[in-house]
């Protein structure tokens, strides 16, 4: 068990703070909830603190919750591939560029680390080149979320990881908006981290609303499990 992994044996409170600017539309989001890495479970509620969110909530899911991949459930035989927990408590910097097909792109930079007993994800997001009547600024996405696989590989040069995946957002007219994600994570501290073999995270997300919440918000339930690395030969002969 890595030293960081010991911090995730129970339920951990989570705070998320985002400052965004998409095509000049500025906004802020605050989120809170908890994560339980034993089950790879995240429960979070996000509120736009600046009024109405200028982009659809589903376009921010990867920035919020795929931001705290340290809550992913890594099976016993894969624990030595869990970069995310091994970087804690000092944490990691997570940078992404997200390309929306035939529309604009988001760039994000986040610091994910423990502040006391709370896991905090502080994010800066900048969006450019969006079409004012497109699927994103035109709010044409359905309020739901598909399952995805998130592919992880070691980046030995940067002592971190590189992550690639494509998100499929459902559009109201029945078509799909693709979002091509490129991600890199680097540790904040200078302690040792686990550099993984290639594997993937399998994600399932459910979006809902709080009937008692008047502000623009999103409620998120997510399960994330690591996969893609088989048991070693020694496991087979036990």
């Amino acid at each position: 068990m890595s030293k960081g992994e010991e911090l995730f044996t129970g339920v951990v409170p989570i705070l998320v703070e985002l400052d965004g600017d998409v095509n000049g539309h500025k906004f802020s989001v605050s989120g809170e909830g908890e994560g339980d890495a034993t089950y790879g479970k995240l429960t979070l509620k996000f509120i736009c603190t600046t009024g109405k969110l200028p982009v659809p909530w589903p376009t921010l899911v990867t920035t919020f919750s795929y931001g705290v991949q340290c809550f992913s459930r890594y099976p016993d035989h894969m624990k030595q591939h869990d970069f995310f927990k091994s970087a804690m408590p000092e944490g990691y910097v997570q940078e992404r560029t997200i390309f929306f097909k035939d529309d604009g792109n988001y760039k994000t930079r986040a610091e994910v680390k423990f502040e006391g007993d709370t896991l905090v994800n502080r994010i800066e997001l900048k969006g450019i080149d969006f079409k004012e009547d497109g699927n994103i600024l035109g709010h044409k996405l359905e309020y739901n979320y598909n399952s995805h696989n998130v592919y992880i590989m070691a980046d030995k040069q940067k002592n971190g990881i590189k992550v690639n995946f494509k998100i499929r957002h459902n559009i109201e007219d029945g078509s799909v908006q693709l979002a091509d994600h490129y991600q890199q994570n680097t540790p904040i501290g200078d302690g040792p981290v686990l550099l993984p073999d290639n594997h993937y995270l399998s994600t399932q997300s459910a979006l809902s609303k709080d009937p008692n919440e008047k502000r623009d918000h999103m409620v998120l339930l997510e399960f994330v499990t690591a996969a893609g690395i088989t048991h070693g030969m020694d496991e087979l002969y036990k």
Epitope: R96, K101, K107
Partner: nanobody, 115 residues
């Protein structure tokens, strides 16, 4: 760092075609997408077309149906094929390379004049 060199601009008649080239060199492993932007006199810079490392292609409104972006990985070059050019396409065309983190790389630009 990444260096970008554009070529292929020039003067063309309305209805004509041009092919712009953008040759990339340097730390190209850090690049996740290369695209073209343009800026006409007195106007804001606008996105024309973009191709990501995975091959996903995106076109701006002005390019849809008339322009085609492609790449030659062996030559580390991205092309913009422009057909049915109109005077409104007159602009300086810039090559842009994106990395994962904040900050992009830009070329010096190549002038396209449709007249």
């Amino acid at each position: 760092d990444v260096q970008l060199v554009e070529s292929g601009g020039g003067l063309v008649q309305p209805g004509g075609s041009l092919r712009l080239s953008c040759a990339a060199s340097g730390e190209i492993a850090s690049i996740i997408a290369i695209g073209w932007y343009r800026q006409a006199p007195g106007k804001q810079r606008e996105s024309v077309a973009l191709i990501t490392r995975s091959g996903m292609i995106t076109y701006g409104d002005s390019a849809q149906g008339r322009f085609t972006i492609s790449r030659d990985d062996a030559k580390n070059t991205v092309y913009l094929h422009m057909d049915d050019l109109v005077p409104e396409d007159t602009a300086v065309y810039y090559c842009n390379a994106k990395k994962v983190s904040f900050g992009d790389y830009w070329g010096q630009g190549t002038q396209v004049t449709v007249s």
